[in-house]
Protein backbone atom coordinates (compact mmCIF):
# COMPACT_ATOMS: atom_id res chain seq x y z
CA UNK A 1 0.00 0.00 0.00
CA UNK A 2 1.51 3.32 -1.02
CA UNK A 3 0.06 6.69 -0.09
CA UNK A 4 0.60 10.03 -1.78
CA UNK A 5 1.76 12.85 0.51
CA UNK A 6 -1.19 14.98 1.58
CA UNK A 7 -1.37 18.53 2.83
CA UNK A 8 -3.68 18.67 5.87
CA UNK A 9 -6.03 21.03 4.03
CA UNK A 10 -6.39 18.52 1.19
CA UNK A 11 -7.10 15.79 3.73
CA UNK A 12 -9.74 17.97 5.36
CA UNK A 13 -11.43 18.93 2.10
CA UNK A 14 -11.37 15.44 0.57
CA UNK A 15 -12.83 13.76 3.65
CA UNK A 16 -16.50 13.27 4.42
CA UNK A 17 -15.81 13.31 8.12
CA UNK A 18 -13.17 14.92 10.28
CA UNK A 19 -13.38 14.18 13.97
CA UNK A 20 -11.34 14.10 17.13
CA UNK A 21 -11.56 10.73 18.85
CA UNK A 22 -9.89 8.23 21.12
CA UNK A 23 -9.24 4.59 20.21
CA UNK A 24 -10.73 2.33 22.86
CA UNK A 25 -8.95 -0.96 22.22
CA UNK A 26 -7.93 -3.68 19.80
CA UNK A 27 -9.80 -4.16 16.52
CA UNK A 28 -12.26 -6.94 15.82
CA UNK A 29 -13.03 -8.57 12.49
CA UNK A 30 -16.57 -8.25 11.21
CA UNK A 31 -17.00 -11.66 9.65
CA UNK A 32 -19.67 -10.74 7.11
CA UNK A 33 -17.90 -7.72 5.65
CA UNK A 34 -14.30 -8.83 6.33
CA UNK A 35 -13.47 -5.41 7.70
CA UNK A 36 -11.61 -4.61 10.88
CA UNK A 37 -13.53 -2.45 13.31
CA UNK A 38 -11.96 -0.21 15.93
CA UNK A 39 -14.08 1.06 18.78
CA UNK A 40 -13.62 4.81 19.11
CA UNK A 41 -14.94 7.54 21.38
CA UNK A 42 -15.63 10.71 19.44
CA UNK A 43 -14.87 13.88 21.36
CA UNK A 44 -15.53 16.49 18.66
CA UNK A 45 -16.81 16.64 15.11
CA UNK A 46 -14.94 19.10 12.91
CA UNK A 47 -16.49 18.25 9.55
CA UNK A 48 -19.41 16.13 8.43
CA UNK A 49 -22.41 17.63 10.20
CA UNK A 50 -24.41 17.71 6.96
CA UNK A 51 -23.48 14.17 5.92
CA UNK A 52 -24.19 12.68 9.31
CA UNK A 53 -27.57 14.25 9.93
CA UNK A 54 -29.04 13.22 13.25
CA UNK A 55 -26.23 10.85 14.25
CA UNK A 56 -24.79 11.96 17.57
CA UNK A 57 -21.44 10.27 17.12
CA UNK A 58 -19.47 7.37 15.75
CA UNK A 59 -18.66 4.37 17.90
CA UNK A 60 -16.55 2.56 15.33
CA UNK A 61 -14.00 3.16 12.60
CA UNK A 62 -13.83 0.54 9.84
CA UNK A 63 -10.76 -0.41 7.81
CA UNK A 64 -9.80 -3.19 5.36
CA UNK A 65 -8.62 -6.34 7.13
CA UNK A 66 -5.41 -6.74 5.14
CA UNK A 67 -2.32 -4.61 4.75
CA UNK A 68 -2.33 -5.02 0.96
CA UNK A 69 -5.74 -3.33 0.81
CA UNK A 70 -4.41 -0.39 2.82
CA UNK A 71 -5.87 -1.44 6.13
CA UNK A 72 -5.02 0.89 9.01
CA UNK A 73 -3.16 -0.39 12.07
CA UNK A 74 -3.49 1.60 15.26
CA UNK A 75 -0.24 1.23 17.17
CA UNK A 76 -0.83 3.44 20.20
CA UNK A 77 -1.98 1.64 23.35
CA UNK A 78 -2.90 4.89 25.08
CA UNK A 79 -6.68 5.05 25.28
CA UNK A 80 -6.66 8.61 26.58
CA UNK A 81 -4.73 9.93 23.57
CA UNK A 82 -6.87 11.99 21.22
CA UNK A 83 -6.49 11.60 17.46
CA UNK A 84 -7.57 13.66 14.51
CA UNK A 85 -9.31 11.29 12.08
CA UNK A 86 -10.15 12.34 8.52
CA UNK A 87 -12.21 9.58 6.94
CA UNK A 88 -14.93 8.65 4.49
CA UNK A 89 -18.58 7.95 5.14
CA UNK A 90 -19.90 4.67 3.72
CA UNK A 91 -23.31 3.27 4.58
CA UNK A 92 -23.40 5.55 7.57
CA UNK A 93 -20.08 4.27 8.90
CA UNK A 94 -16.70 5.95 9.29
CA UNK A 95 -14.08 4.30 7.07
CA UNK A 96 -10.34 4.83 7.33
CA UNK A 97 -7.28 3.40 5.57
CA UNK A 98 -3.54 3.44 5.98
CA UNK A 99 -3.58 6.54 3.76
CA UNK A 100 -6.07 8.44 5.89
CA UNK A 101 -4.90 11.60 7.62
CA UNK A 102 -4.90 10.22 11.14
CA UNK A 103 -2.54 11.74 13.68
CA UNK A 104 -2.40 12.44 17.40
CA UNK A 105 -4.11 15.78 17.99
CA UNK A 106 -1.17 17.02 20.07
CA UNK A 107 1.20 16.31 17.16
CA UNK A 108 -0.51 18.97 15.07
CA UNK A 109 0.90 22.48 15.21
CA UNK A 110 -1.33 25.05 16.95
CA UNK A 111 -1.91 26.58 13.51
CA UNK A 112 -3.07 23.23 12.10
CA UNK A 113 -5.35 22.64 15.08
CA UNK A 114 -6.93 26.02 14.51
CA UNK A 115 -7.24 25.38 10.77
CA UNK A 116 -8.96 22.02 11.23
CA UNK A 117 -11.46 23.66 13.55
CA UNK A 118 -12.35 26.61 11.34
CA UNK A 119 -9.96 27.75 8.60
CA UNK A 120 -9.42 24.92 6.10
CA UNK A 121 -13.13 24.78 5.30
CA UNK A 122 -12.93 28.20 3.64
CA UNK A 123 -10.72 26.75 0.93
CA UNK A 124 -12.74 23.60 0.20
CA UNK A 125 -14.26 23.51 -3.26
CA UNK A 126 -12.61 26.80 -4.13
CA UNK A 127 -8.87 26.34 -3.77
CA UNK A 128 -6.56 23.42 -4.51
CA UNK A 129 -3.24 22.58 -2.89
CA UNK A 130 -1.08 21.52 -5.84
CA UNK A 131 1.83 19.26 -4.86
CA UNK A 132 5.20 20.09 -6.36
CA UNK A 133 7.25 16.92 -6.10
CA UNK A 134 9.84 17.58 -8.79
CA UNK A 135 11.37 20.68 -10.35
CA UNK A 136 10.24 22.29 -12.57
CA UNK A 137 6.60 22.55 -11.62
CA UNK A 138 4.11 25.31 -12.23
CA UNK A 139 0.59 26.21 -11.32
CA UNK A 140 -2.16 25.17 -13.69
CA UNK A 141 -4.73 27.59 -12.34
CA UNK A 142 -5.04 30.73 -10.23
CA UNK A 143 -7.11 28.67 -7.82
CA UNK A 144 -4.07 26.48 -7.09
CA UNK A 145 -1.39 27.01 -4.47
CA UNK A 146 1.97 25.39 -5.12
CA UNK A 147 2.93 23.03 -2.26
CA UNK A 148 6.72 22.82 -2.16
CA UNK A 149 7.41 21.20 1.23
CA UNK A 150 8.53 17.92 -0.37
CA UNK A 151 11.19 19.68 -2.43
CA UNK A 152 12.32 22.31 0.07
CA UNK A 153 12.05 20.24 3.23
CA UNK A 154 12.34 16.72 1.83
CA UNK A 155 9.14 15.88 3.68
CA UNK A 156 5.41 16.49 3.55
CA UNK A 157 5.71 17.93 7.04
CA UNK A 158 7.09 21.36 6.23
CA UNK A 159 6.42 25.03 6.73
CA UNK A 160 3.48 25.22 4.35
CA UNK A 161 1.93 22.13 5.86
CA UNK A 162 2.39 23.34 9.43
CA UNK A 163 1.57 27.03 9.12
CA UNK A 164 -0.32 27.86 5.91
CA UNK A 165 -3.65 27.28 4.20
CA UNK A 166 -4.59 27.80 0.57
CA UNK A 167 -7.46 30.27 0.76
CA UNK A 168 -9.35 32.58 -1.60
CA UNK A 169 -7.80 36.04 -1.83
CA UNK A 170 -10.58 37.12 -4.16
CA UNK A 171 -13.13 35.18 -6.23
CA UNK A 172 -10.55 34.26 -8.89
CA UNK A 173 -7.38 33.87 -6.89
CA UNK A 174 -6.16 31.55 -4.14
CA UNK A 175 -2.95 32.16 -2.20
CA UNK A 176 -1.10 30.69 0.73
CA UNK A 177 -2.25 32.48 3.85
CA UNK A 178 -0.49 32.34 7.18
CA UNK A 179 -2.38 30.57 9.95
CA UNK A 180 -0.87 32.67 12.71
CA UNK A 181 -2.47 35.53 14.59
CA UNK A 182 -2.99 37.55 11.44
CA UNK A 183 -4.81 35.88 8.57
CA UNK A 184 -3.76 38.53 6.06
CA UNK A 185 -0.12 37.64 5.54
CA UNK A 186 0.55 35.75 2.32
CA UNK A 187 3.47 33.47 1.62
CA UNK A 188 5.92 35.38 -0.59
CA UNK A 189 6.12 34.15 -4.19
CA UNK A 190 3.16 31.88 -3.58
CA UNK A 191 2.10 32.20 -7.20
CA UNK A 192 5.58 31.94 -8.72
CA UNK A 193 6.91 28.90 -10.51
CA UNK A 194 9.23 26.71 -8.50
Amino acid sequence: CSCAPTHPQTAFCNSDLVIRAKFMGSPEIIETTLYQRYEIKMTKMLKGFDAVGNATGFRFAYTPAMESLCGYVHKSQNRSEEFLIAGRLRNGNLHITACSFLVPWHNLSPAQQKAFVKTYSAGCGVCTVFPCSAIPCKLESDSHCLWTDQILMGSEKGYQSDHFACLPRNPDLCTWQYLGVSMTRSLPLAKAEA
Partner: antibody, heavy 117, light 110 residues
Framework: QVQLVESGGGLVQPGGSLRLSCAAS????????MSWVRQAPGKGLEWVSA????????YYADSVKGRFTISRDNSKNTLYLQMNSLRAEDTAVYYC??????????WGQGTLVTVSS | DIALTQPASVSGSPGQSITISCTGT?????????VSWYQQHPGKAPKLMIY???NRPSGVSNRFSGSKSGNTASLTISGLQAEDEADYYC??????????FGGGTKLTVL
Amino acid sequence: QVQLVESGGGLVQPGGSLRLSCAASGFTFSSYAMSWVRQAPGKGLEWVSAISGSGGSTYYADSVKGRFTISRDNSKNTLYLQMNSLRAEDTAVYYCARGGFFNMDYWGQGTLVTVSS
Amino acid sequence: DIALTQPASVSGSPGQSITISCTGTSSDVGGYNYVSWYQQHPGKAPKLMIYDVSNRPSGVSNRFSGSKSGNTASLTISGLQAEDEADYYCQSYDFTYGSVFGGGTKLTVL
Protein backbone atom coordinates in the same frame (compact mmCIF):
# COMPACT_ATOMS: atom_id res chain seq x y z
CA GLN B 1 -28.61 -28.49 6.56
CA VAL B 2 -25.64 -26.51 5.27
CA GLN B 3 -24.14 -27.90 2.06
CA LEU B 4 -21.28 -26.72 -0.12
CA VAL B 5 -20.62 -28.49 -3.41
CA GLU B 6 -17.59 -27.61 -5.53
CA SER B 7 -17.26 -28.26 -9.25
CA GLY B 8 -15.12 -27.25 -12.20
CA GLY B 9 -11.86 -28.98 -11.35
CA GLY B 10 -9.89 -30.99 -13.87
CA LEU B 11 -6.67 -31.26 -15.84
CA VAL B 12 -5.29 -28.08 -17.37
CA GLN B 13 -2.01 -27.17 -19.02
CA PRO B 14 0.42 -24.66 -17.46
CA GLY B 15 -0.66 -21.14 -18.40
CA GLY B 16 -4.25 -22.27 -18.82
CA SER B 17 -7.42 -21.18 -17.04
CA LEU B 18 -10.13 -22.85 -15.02
CA ARG B 19 -13.23 -21.64 -13.22
CA LEU B 20 -14.35 -23.33 -10.03
CA SER B 21 -17.87 -23.06 -8.67
CA CYS B 22 -19.29 -23.74 -5.23
CA ALA B 23 -23.04 -24.16 -4.86
CA ALA B 24 -24.27 -23.30 -1.37
CA SER B 25 -27.51 -24.29 0.31
CA GLY B 26 -29.06 -24.53 3.76
CA PHE B 27 -28.14 -21.03 4.96
CA THR B 28 -28.54 -17.35 4.03
CA PHE B 29 -25.65 -17.18 1.59
CA SER B 30 -25.33 -13.38 1.42
CA SER B 31 -24.89 -13.14 5.20
CA TYR B 32 -21.58 -14.99 5.19
CA ALA B 33 -18.10 -14.34 3.94
CA MET B 34 -16.76 -17.25 1.92
CA SER B 35 -13.29 -18.60 1.22
CA TRP B 36 -11.31 -20.89 -1.01
CA VAL B 37 -8.67 -23.09 0.64
CA ARG B 38 -6.44 -25.53 -1.21
CA GLN B 39 -4.40 -28.59 -0.33
CA ALA B 40 -1.61 -29.85 -2.55
CA PRO B 41 -1.24 -33.66 -2.66
CA GLY B 42 0.23 -34.87 0.63
CA LYS B 43 0.61 -31.31 1.90
CA GLY B 44 -1.12 -28.99 4.35
CA LEU B 45 -3.93 -26.48 3.98
CA GLU B 46 -3.34 -23.12 2.30
CA TRP B 47 -5.78 -20.21 2.38
CA VAL B 48 -6.28 -18.87 -1.13
CA SER B 49 -8.91 -16.14 -1.12
CA ALA B 50 -11.90 -14.69 0.72
CA ILE B 51 -14.89 -12.55 -0.21
CA SER B 52 -17.33 -10.60 1.94
CA GLY B 53 -21.02 -11.42 2.08
CA SER B 54 -21.93 -8.64 -0.34
CA GLY B 55 -19.00 -9.36 -2.63
CA GLY B 56 -17.69 -5.85 -2.07
CA SER B 57 -14.42 -6.87 -0.42
CA THR B 58 -12.03 -9.47 -1.78
CA TYR B 59 -8.73 -10.72 -0.36
CA TYR B 60 -6.02 -12.95 -1.81
CA ALA B 61 -2.96 -14.86 -0.71
CA ASP B 62 0.24 -13.49 -2.21
CA SER B 63 0.77 -16.74 -4.12
CA VAL B 64 -2.34 -16.19 -6.28
CA LYS B 65 -2.70 -12.41 -6.34
CA GLY B 66 -3.13 -11.10 -9.87
CA ARG B 67 -3.91 -14.56 -11.26
CA PHE B 68 -7.00 -15.67 -9.36
CA THR B 69 -10.30 -13.81 -8.96
CA ILE B 70 -12.91 -14.66 -6.35
CA SER B 71 -16.52 -13.64 -6.93
CA ARG B 72 -20.02 -14.60 -5.89
CA ASP B 73 -23.56 -14.47 -7.21
CA ASN B 74 -25.86 -14.12 -4.21
CA SER B 75 -28.95 -14.58 -6.38
CA LYS B 76 -27.65 -18.04 -7.32
CA ASN B 77 -26.07 -18.87 -3.96
CA THR B 78 -22.83 -19.60 -5.78
CA LEU B 79 -19.18 -18.81 -5.10
CA TYR B 80 -16.61 -18.74 -7.91
CA LEU B 81 -12.85 -18.86 -8.33
CA GLN B 82 -11.50 -17.84 -11.72
CA MET B 83 -7.96 -19.19 -12.05
CA ASN B 84 -5.71 -17.84 -14.81
CA SER B 85 -2.03 -18.35 -15.67
CA LEU B 86 -2.07 -21.66 -13.83
CA ARG B 87 1.20 -23.19 -12.67
CA ALA B 88 2.23 -26.69 -11.65
CA GLU B 89 2.33 -25.54 -8.02
CA ASP B 90 -1.39 -24.69 -8.19
CA THR B 91 -2.14 -28.42 -8.39
CA ALA B 92 -4.31 -29.17 -5.36
CA VAL B 93 -7.72 -30.07 -4.03
CA TYR B 94 -9.66 -26.81 -3.80
CA TYR B 95 -12.21 -26.47 -1.01
CA CYS B 96 -14.81 -23.76 -0.61
CA ALA B 97 -15.60 -22.94 2.99
CA ARG B 98 -18.04 -20.74 4.87
CA GLY B 99 -16.08 -18.03 6.66
CA GLY B 100 -13.41 -15.52 5.77
CA PHE B 101 -10.02 -15.58 7.46
CA PHE B 102 -10.81 -18.03 10.26
CA ASN B 103 -13.64 -19.99 11.90
CA MET B 104 -14.52 -21.82 8.68
CA ASP B 105 -17.39 -23.86 9.99
CA TYR B 106 -18.53 -25.70 6.87
CA TRP B 107 -16.48 -27.10 3.99
CA GLY B 108 -17.26 -28.65 0.64
CA GLN B 109 -15.91 -32.03 -0.40
CA GLY B 110 -13.27 -30.41 -2.62
CA THR B 111 -12.49 -30.47 -6.32
CA LEU B 112 -9.14 -31.55 -7.75
CA VAL B 113 -7.22 -29.20 -10.03
CA THR B 114 -4.24 -30.72 -11.85
CA VAL B 115 -1.88 -28.45 -13.76
CA SER B 116 0.34 -30.52 -16.02
CA SER B 117 1.55 -30.67 -19.58
CA ASP C 1 5.85 -20.11 2.67
CA ILE C 2 4.40 -18.30 5.66
CA ALA C 3 2.98 -20.86 8.07
CA LEU C 4 2.37 -21.33 11.76
CA THR C 5 4.64 -23.88 13.39
CA GLN C 6 3.15 -27.18 14.53
CA PRO C 7 4.87 -30.42 15.47
CA ALA C 8 4.82 -32.84 12.55
CA SER C 9 3.43 -35.65 14.67
CA VAL C 10 2.20 -36.53 18.14
CA SER C 11 0.96 -39.78 19.56
CA GLY C 12 -0.84 -41.10 22.59
CA SER C 13 -2.62 -44.14 23.91
CA PRO C 14 -6.40 -44.41 24.25
CA GLY C 15 -7.59 -42.55 27.34
CA GLN C 16 -4.54 -40.33 27.52
CA SER C 17 -4.40 -36.58 26.89
CA ILE C 18 -2.25 -34.96 24.22
CA THR C 19 -1.53 -31.32 23.38
CA ILE C 20 -0.66 -29.91 19.96
CA SER C 21 1.09 -26.54 19.89
CA CYS C 22 0.83 -23.86 17.22
CA THR C 23 3.42 -21.11 17.32
CA GLY C 24 3.12 -17.88 15.39
CA THR C 25 4.04 -14.24 15.91
CA SER C 26 2.54 -11.11 17.40
CA SER C 27 1.11 -10.40 13.94
CA ASP C 28 -1.09 -13.49 13.94
CA VAL C 29 -1.60 -15.81 16.92
CA GLY C 30 -0.32 -13.34 19.49
CA GLY C 31 -2.08 -10.31 18.08
CA TYR C 32 -5.66 -11.55 17.82
CA ASN C 33 -8.00 -14.02 19.47
CA TYR C 34 -8.81 -15.50 16.08
CA VAL C 35 -7.30 -18.96 16.22
CA SER C 36 -9.16 -21.96 14.82
CA TRP C 37 -8.36 -25.68 14.89
CA TYR C 38 -9.42 -28.21 12.24
CA GLN C 39 -9.48 -32.01 12.15
CA GLN C 40 -8.98 -33.78 8.84
CA HIS C 41 -9.32 -37.49 8.25
CA PRO C 42 -7.64 -38.96 5.13
CA GLY C 43 -9.54 -38.14 1.95
CA LYS C 44 -12.05 -35.98 3.82
CA ALA C 45 -12.68 -32.24 4.12
CA PRO C 46 -11.43 -30.43 7.24
CA LYS C 47 -13.81 -30.05 10.18
CA LEU C 48 -13.83 -27.06 12.54
CA MET C 49 -13.08 -28.22 16.10
CA ILE C 50 -12.22 -24.98 17.92
CA TYR C 51 -12.88 -21.35 17.01
CA ASP C 52 -11.81 -18.03 18.55
CA VAL C 53 -9.00 -19.76 20.50
CA SER C 54 -11.13 -21.75 22.91
CA ASN C 55 -14.74 -22.10 21.74
CA ARG C 56 -16.26 -25.39 20.58
CA PRO C 57 -18.86 -25.52 17.80
CA SER C 58 -21.99 -27.42 18.68
CA GLY C 59 -21.57 -31.13 18.09
CA VAL C 60 -17.85 -31.17 18.90
CA SER C 61 -16.92 -33.30 21.90
CA ASN C 62 -15.90 -31.50 25.08
CA ARG C 63 -12.77 -33.65 25.05
CA PHE C 64 -11.38 -31.01 22.69
CA SER C 65 -10.23 -27.73 24.18
CA GLY C 66 -8.16 -24.78 23.02
CA SER C 67 -6.05 -22.13 24.71
CA LYS C 68 -3.47 -19.48 23.95
CA SER C 69 -0.46 -17.98 25.70
CA GLY C 70 1.51 -15.25 23.98
CA ASN C 71 2.29 -16.28 20.42
CA THR C 72 1.45 -19.95 20.96
CA ALA C 73 -1.96 -21.58 20.74
CA SER C 74 -2.66 -25.11 21.91
CA LEU C 75 -5.19 -27.83 21.21
CA THR C 76 -5.69 -30.41 23.93
CA ILE C 77 -7.52 -33.69 23.40
CA SER C 78 -8.35 -35.58 26.56
CA GLY C 79 -9.54 -39.18 26.83
CA LEU C 80 -7.98 -40.03 23.50
CA GLN C 81 -10.06 -42.30 21.26
CA ALA C 82 -9.23 -44.24 18.11
CA GLU C 83 -11.42 -41.98 15.97
CA ASP C 84 -9.32 -38.97 16.99
CA GLU C 85 -6.51 -40.24 14.77
CA ALA C 86 -6.28 -37.61 12.04
CA ASP C 87 -4.36 -34.55 10.88
CA TYR C 88 -4.89 -31.36 12.88
CA TYR C 89 -4.36 -27.83 11.57
CA CYS C 90 -4.33 -24.53 13.39
CA GLN C 91 -5.29 -21.33 11.59
CA SER C 92 -5.01 -17.67 12.52
CA TYR C 93 -5.98 -14.33 11.10
CA ASP C 94 -2.96 -12.30 10.02
CA PHE C 95 -3.13 -8.63 9.03
CA THR C 96 -0.38 -9.01 6.45
CA TYR C 97 -1.26 -12.39 4.93
CA GLY C 98 -4.99 -12.59 5.60
CA SER C 99 -5.10 -16.11 6.94
CA VAL C 100 -2.31 -18.51 7.83
CA PHE C 101 -2.48 -22.23 8.58
CA GLY C 102 -0.07 -24.36 10.53
CA GLY C 103 1.82 -27.06 8.67
CA GLY C 104 -0.37 -29.73 10.24
CA THR C 105 0.16 -32.36 12.93
CA LYS C 106 -0.45 -36.07 12.41
CA LEU C 107 -2.03 -37.56 15.53
CA THR C 108 -1.50 -41.28 16.00
CA VAL C 109 -3.52 -43.19 18.57
CA LEU C 110 -1.32 -46.10 19.67
